[in-house]
Amino acid sequence: ESALITQQDLAPQQRAAPQQKRSSPSEGLCPPGHHISEDGRDCISCKYGQDYSTHWNDLLFCLRCTRCDSGEVELSPCTTTRNTVCQCEEGTFREEDSPEMCRKCRTGCPRGMVKVGDCTPWSDIECVHKESGTKHSGEVPAVEETVTSSPGTPASPCSLSG
């Protein structure tokens, strides 16, 4: 959890409230669900629903919980040890190239192509050429046939904290 932290991941400034549980670090590290105190003597629990930590750490704060965007559904809430898991709404998907937003799935394949894969929260419909069986690049075609797809809804996390 040390190397990949960006400042936007971090929780707003907060001091340890009296009700926050404390324990002692083990070999200078605090367990998941906690962060370390300034003097390194205590482990302070993260605040449920506000922030979290997934690994043993010596960080001064827990990481801020992700809020699902509009166009996303929350599959599982943020806990002290795991970030929120969000997923694109039915009929939309998130690409690896543009993970910041959910895009609408195409409604059908271009002429001369057939649908071999449904719209899922993590992929657009998949089209292949009728003859060759080669996949279509995914560019939105100028003309589409009225081959409609029924969006699939398998669960997939949009923000893993593993």
């Epitope: 971090l10 001091r15 962060h35 370390i36 003597r41 001064l60 704060f61």
Partner: nanobody, 123 residues
Framework: EVQLLESGGGEVQPGGSLRLSCAAS????????MSWFRQAPGKGLEFVCA????????YYAESVKGRFTCSRDNAKNTLYLQMSSLRAEDTAVYYC????????????????WGQGTLVTVKP
């Protein structure tokens, strides 16, 4: 982007005083430690002092306790090092550094470093 800019270095006589400043920008962490390290000619980096922004916990190296004071100005996001009773062995390049880890007196716990400012103590 985090930037640290040290200033205030120079030449001073033994027993003299000097104040170093470290202006920080781009820091939006909820809490962090700002420290001074120094590197004498031909030697490794040595921890001098650290101050934590949220709780204000301060640490000093034994070699500077009672002579150096580490302080901060939250509004200016600036760290200071007031050095007095300076000795020849205090001659070094002084670096400002930032950590997001607790009880950080080791260099490897620091992610951000300034360019350094030279302090020379000689008669």
């Amino acid at each position: 982007e985090v930037q640290l800019l040290e200033s205030g270095g120079g030449e001073v006589q033994p027993g003299g005083s000097l104040r170093l400043s470290c202006a920080a920008s781009g820091l939006t962490f909820p809490n962090y430690g700002m420290s001074w390290f120094r590197q004498a000619p031909g030697k490794g980096l040595e921890f001098v002092c650290a101050i934590y922004w949220s709780g204000g916990t301060v640490y000093y190296a034994e070699s500077v306790k009672g002579r150096f004071t580490c302080s901060r100005d939250n509004a200016k996001n600036t760290l200071y090092l007031q050095m007095s009773s300076l000795r020849a062995e205090d001659t070094a390049v002084y670096y400002c550094a930032v950590t997001i880890r607790g009880a950080a007196t080791q260099t490897w716990k620091y992610d951000y470093w300034g360019q350094g400012t030279l302090v020379t103590v000689k008669p």
